[in-house]
């Protein structure tokens, strides 16, 4: 369905409000350092131009591609070279190379100030004074800090953000109403960003086939009553949506996502019995709800998998005729029977099955060769089961903060070259798997835990890719998407690491720690713990625990002191000196 003017087509499909919001997100995700006002100006110019194309699709430049129009607009920014350096060279290229160039310069860890939440009254005043600007600013600030945030989902977050302010700024106790809602949006937003980052990494680093395999497994778990052909259609459409969003084609992505939600709801009888409530909601809520919908019940009396995939004499014939379709059917059949497995485990099983068929279908007696293929699955299934059992036991024993600390020590010893902020951020997130997943019954633990860990380890991979410092991280991140977690789990202490020179400044603390939130205080202590391990990688976990407990006692004492700063200076020197002696620093 070719349109004379792509920009007019998307403007009409999406409506002005969504069009403007999505263009703002796109621009902020590309030019992450540009001031808000500059982006608003660019968006208004693009919107005015789109309106002329709606009025007359044959008007000048209306036939240009969205990449051409948007790229030309971004390249009008006066300070491009001063602000972005070599990214300005993208503007010398032609499409599609120019867009690819912009994509390559997206920064997962932009040097932007932390978002500080103003007082509730200040926020409510700003909201009432200019609601439109207030909400645009939200989109801009999130998009520039999360350059791969799933754009149509960000529109859903913005809608909830607006609803929170609309309700709470009229409440008797504004803060009690608003702050929990903002906390929830922040936490959900970070999780959503990280999940989408994994989808984009999967597409960009491992290709469409890898993403489609992930989607087959996940959708088959979620919609086990749907036919294989139905799941395949959904996978194709979903892949298109995410390819577009990850490629910066946000208007097409949002439009196609809406079409996919419409299709799913029109065909829910052949997809899932769990979609009814979702499909009664407005568009943004509907798409979000479908993406999060619980797994449907498995059909009763599903036959054994072995009949079609091991015992049949036609296995090699079927495989040879259409390899990816046959493997897709295997993955579909296995996944719909195993909502208790993680997606990455299902993909490992499919890969093992594929490798076995590749080998055996060339053998003298193929059937004899692949007859025991399902036996090879047992250790692959048991490994994550055991790991999750051990770590959940450790989590129950230690609680979240100390469990995070155990992981901090574990990962710092594995990859001590990684920057301290990255190790702290990633280990804290790894540690959240406990409270997120260990509460679930056995049947839900593995999909919760291992698929969450895949998301967190991808954060490590994308942050490390920006400034690579560890061959071991590079190896685990690039060799196999589905084996990242087992690869990191298998890493032992890095014996080649030369301990970091001791720097007393790293362990110097001031009275400002006393006024920090509990979370910020934890991060300070965890930063010190990572540095301690980097200085003394051979320290035992008992030694590190003792030093950290003493450090906590020192902070507690000095925060109670009348002259806090003097206490931190004098007692801190003693603590550092004693720690140096005790750990042989």
């Amino acid at each position: 369905d070719a349109h004379k003017s792509e920009v007019a087509h998307r403007f009409k499909d999406l409506g002005e409000e969504n069009f403007k919001a999505l263009v703002l997100i796109a621009f902020a995700q590309y030019l992450q350092q540009c001031p808000f006002e500059d982006h608003v100006k660019l968006v208004n110019e693009v919107t005015e131009f789109a309106k002329t194309c709606v009025a007359d699709e044959s008007a000048e430049n209306c036939d240009k591609s969205l990449h051409t129009l948007f790229g030309d607009k971004l390249c009008t920014v006066a300070t491009l070279r001063e602000t972005y350096g070599e990214m300005a060279d993208c503007c010398a290229k032609q499409e599609p190379e120019r867009n690819e160039c912009f994509l390559q310069h997206k920064d997962d860890n932009p040097n932007l100030p932390r978002l500080v939440r103003p007082e509730v009254d200040v926020m409510c005043t700003a909201f009432h004074d200019n609601e439109e600007t207030f909400l645009k600013k939200y989109l801009y600030e999130i998009a520039r800090r999360h350059p791969y945030f799933y754009a149509p989902e960000l529109l859903f977050f913005a809608k909830r953000y607006k609803a929170a302010f609309t309700e709470c700024c009229q409440a008797a106790d504004k803060a009690a109403c608003l702050l929990p809602k903002l906390d929830e949006l922040r936490d959900e937003g970070k999780a959503s960003s990280a999940k989408q980052r994994l989808k984009c990494a999967s597409l960009q680093k491992f290709g469409e086939r890898a993403f489609k395999a992930w989607a087959v497994a996940r959708l088959s778990q979620r919609f086990p009553k749907a036919e294989f052909a139905e799941v395949s259609k959904l996978v194709t459409d979903l892949t298109k949506v995410h390819t577009e969003c990850c490629h910066g084609d946000l208007l097409e992505c949002a439009d196609d996502r809406a079409d996919l939600a419409k299709y799913i709801c029109e065909n829910q009888d052949s997809i899932s019995s769990k979609l009814k409530e979702c499909c009664e909601k407005p568009l943004l809520e509907k798409s979000h709800c479908i993406a999060e919908v619980e797994n449907d019940e498995m059909p009763a009396d599903l036959p054994s998998l072995a009949a079609d995939f091991v015992e049949s004499k036609d296995v090699c014939k079927n495989y040879a005729e259409a390899k990816d379709v046959f493997l897709g059917m295997f993955l579909y059949e296995y996944a719909r029977r195993h909502p208790d497995y993680s997606v990455v485990l299902l993909l490992r099983l499919a890969k093992t099955y594929e490798t076995t068929l590749e080998k055996c279908c060339a053998a003298a007696d193929p059937h004899e060769c692949y007859a025991k293929v399902f036996d090879e699955f047992k250790p692959l299934v048991e490994e994550p089961q055991n790991l999750i059992k051990q770590n959940c036991e450790l989590f129950e024993q230690l609680g979240e903060y100390k469990f995070q600390n155990a992981l901090l020590v574990r990962y710092t010893k594995k990859v001590p070259q990684v920057s301290t902020p990255t190790l702290v951020e990633v280990s804290r997130n790894l540690g959240k798997v406990g409270s997120k997943c260990c509460k679930h019954p056995e049947a839900k633990r593995m999909p919760c835990a291992e698929d969450y860990l895949s998301v967190v380890l991808n954060q490590l991979c994308v942050l490390h890719e920006k400034t690579p410092v560890s061959d071991r991280v590079t190896k685990c991140c690039t060799e196999s998407l589905v084996n990242r977690r087992p690869c990191f789990s298998a890493l032992e202490v890095d014996e080649t690491y030369v301990p970091k020179e001791f720097n007393a400044e790293t362990f110097t603390f001031h009275a400002d720690i006393c006024t920090l939130s509990e979370k910020e205080r934890q991060i300070k202590k965890q930063t010190a713990l990572v540095e301690l391990v980097k200085h003394k990688p051979k320290a035992t976990k008992e030694q590190l625990k003792a030093v950290m407990d003493d450090f906590a006692a020192f902070v507690e004492k000095c925060c109670k002191a009348d002259d806090k700063e003097t206490c931190f200076a004098e007692e801190g020197k003693k603590l550092v000196a004693a720690s140096q002696a005790a750990l042989g620093l």
Partner: nanobody, 118 residues
């Protein structure tokens, strides 16, 4: 409540030895790291030695390394400091405390005087 009581201090000639003991009660002694600290006349508190629960990883300040030995007997809820080759600069009030490298507030003993003099 936490109670720590030392004994074994006294006057000793340079080169001599002393063994300090610290009897603990009011807490699960075997579950905590313990430490010895000292305070010389007109000086601040100085960390001397620490030992982890279970008796692991004894650690010493450079000034006493090779001369002092920390140990514990969890069955008797007692911490020890064997001090050999004593020097005049070891003269101080010695305290035992909960902690490994930092004496916890509110968990320190009354102290025992050690004087090294000819």
């Amino acid at each position: 409540q936490v109670q720590l009581q030392e004994s074994g201090g006294g006057l000793v000639q340079p080169g001599g030895s002393l063994r300090l003991s610290c009897a603990a009660s009011g807490f699960a002694f075997s579950s905590f790291p313990m430490t010895w600290v000292r305070q010389a006349p007109g000086k601040g508190l100085e960390w001397v030695s620490g030992i982890l629960e279970g008796g692991g990883s004894p650690a010493y300040a450079d000034s006493v390394k090779g001369r002092f030995t920390i140990s514990r007997d969890d069955a008797k809820n007692t911490l020890y400091l064997q001090m050999n080759s004593l020097k005049p600069e070891d003269t101080a009030v010695y305290y035992c405390a909960k902690g490994y490298v930092y004496a916890r507030e509110g968990a320190r003993s009354q102290g025992t005087q050690v004087t090294v003099s000819s």
